[in-house]
């Protein structure tokens, strides 16, 4: 019987700013019950507060709900684990929320093949950012990705566009049915899922850019 | 003990390319992104690029933007560095740092340097 | 790309003395600045972040303050193992990029 192992705090993540959850893996629990505990203070502060939320992110979390949770002030947080031979600490964490979001995948992907009569034939990708980000404040810039790939093969073609909401792809192989999707990222953040695949039927007419 | 080890000492000639590696130990290698810091013989410090080794993805010093490549391989919780097209002038140290926490980018962790001699 | 000019670029001082390092950006960058301290043939090693943020470990002598363009360290005590060069950092935007020294050396 020995005191726990050392904790780490391995993972914060935000859907929005407005909340955060932050996850820590346990050290070896010393062949004994091991109880956890999250304290945290605020840069520039020295009073400790415990995580106000163990439950809503499930085992081994702490959940930051919105009065908890403030932009622009770095939390310094660290797990304690206790048994009855001792305690370990994980080493300080800081997290700065403005740079923990992972937003939720690009809503509304439309996909449609466009073929104008003087020009080369294109696929058309539109969508929409997710609800819960505000780009309006301008606290978010959200960079966006595509992947297609033709049904049956194994291989994605990803496209980067920027802060684009749509994007024109034009060396498609005729008639062949495609999978489209699209996944965003604030500019200091985490990638989102990828959004439900769309899928598109190329027509056997469809020309091949040079 | 979080650890960052890179590879020893490399002897470039011109126009070469050179490859350092950075390995971490102690934390989690996904959770912090890791940047890469050069500094030339009694010169400052001159940043290169950052990645974020949960995806591999990465912002670079416009300076080094076409001849500067950083990667991270994290079966092996790796960084890596390539520089091409190697002068005189890219003799220098060459660290990787980490990320002080999940927030802006200042360095609480640093490589022990490795040098870099390019001369032909 | 913001410029981080520091000042002196070196300066000489004896063990109990108040020393003080300046650094000036060339542009507006709130209070994303950081402090390093580097001796010879080591890598840096953070002492202060968000301008006036003492990092875990660091000395209280160790001081930080400043925002917009102006920033400051300070040792309000010098010991013989603070002897060594000190560079500012900014972190506001891309490139991040830092300033070009001050030694401090022993009077």
């Known amino acids: 019987q020995l005191p726990p192992g050392k904790p780490e705090i391995f993972k914060c993540r935000s859907p929005n700013k407005e909340t955060f959850t932050c996850w820590w893996r346990p050290g070896t629990d010393g062949g004994l019950p091991t109880n956890y505990s999250l304290t945290y203070h605020r840069e520039g502060e020295t009073l400790m507060h415990e995580c106000p939320d163990y439950i809503t992110g499930g085992p081994n979390s702490c959940h930051f709900g919105k009065q908890y949770t403030s932009m622009w002030r770095t939390y310094i947080m660290m797990v304690n684990a206790t048994n009855q031979m001792g305690s370990s600490f994980s080493d300080e964490l800081y997290v700065d929320v403005t740079y923990i979001v992972q937003p939720d995948p690009p809503l509304e992907l439309a996909v449609e093949v466009k073929q104008p009569e003087d020009r080369k034939p294109y696929l058309w990708i539109k969508w929409s950012p997710p609800t819960l980000i505000d780009l309006k404040t301008g606290w978010f810039t959200l960079l966006y990705e595509i992947r297609l790939k033709p049904e049956k093969a194994a291989e994605w073609e990803i496209h980067f566009a920027g802060q684009q909401t749509e994007f024109k792809i034009l060396s498609l192989h005729p008639g062949q049915k495609y999978l489209v999707q699209v996944r965003c990222k604030p500019d200091h953040g985490y990638w989102s899922a990828w959004s439900p695949a769309t899928f598109i039927q190329i027509p056997s007419d469809f020309t091949m850019n040079d | 003990e979080v650890q960052l080890v890179q590879s020893g000492a490399e002897v470039k000639k011109p126009g070469s390319s050179v490859k350092v590696s950075c390995k971490a130990s102690?934390?989690?290698?996904?959770?912090?992104?890791m940047h890469w810091v050069r500094q030339a013989p009694g010169q400052g410090l001159e940043w290169m690029g950052e990645i974020d080794p949960s995806d591999s993805y990465s912002n670079y010093n416009q300076k080094f933007k076409d001849r500067v490549t950083i990667t991270a391989d994290k079966s092996t919780s790796t960084a890596y560095m390539e520089l091409s097209s190697l002068r005189s002038e890219d003799t220098a140290v060459y660290y990787c740092a980490r990320n002080g926490g999940l927030g802006p980018a200042w360095f609480s962790y640093w490589g022990q340097g490795t040098l870099v001699t390019v001369s032909s | 790309d913001i410029q981080m000019t520091q000042s002196p670029s070196s300066v000489s001082a004896s063990v109990g003395d108040r020393v003080t390092i300046t650094c000036k950006a060339s542009?507006?960058?709130?209070?994303?600045v950081a402090w390093y301290q580097q001796k010879p043939g080591k890598a840096p090693k953070l002492l202060i972040y968000s301008a006036s943020n003492r990092y875990t470990g660091v000395p209280s002598r160790f001081s930080g303050s400043g925002s917009g363009t102006d920033f400051t360290l300070t040792i309000s005590s010098l010991q013989p193992e603070d002897f060594a060069t000190y560079y500012c950092?900014?972190?506001?935007?891309?490139?991040?990029?830092f300033g070009g020294g001050t030694k401090v050396e022993i009077k």
């Open positions: 542009q507006y960058v709130g209070t994303a």
């Open positions: 950092q900014q972190y506001s935007s891309y490139p991040w990029t």
């Open positions: 102690g934390y989690t290698f996904t959770t912090y992104w």
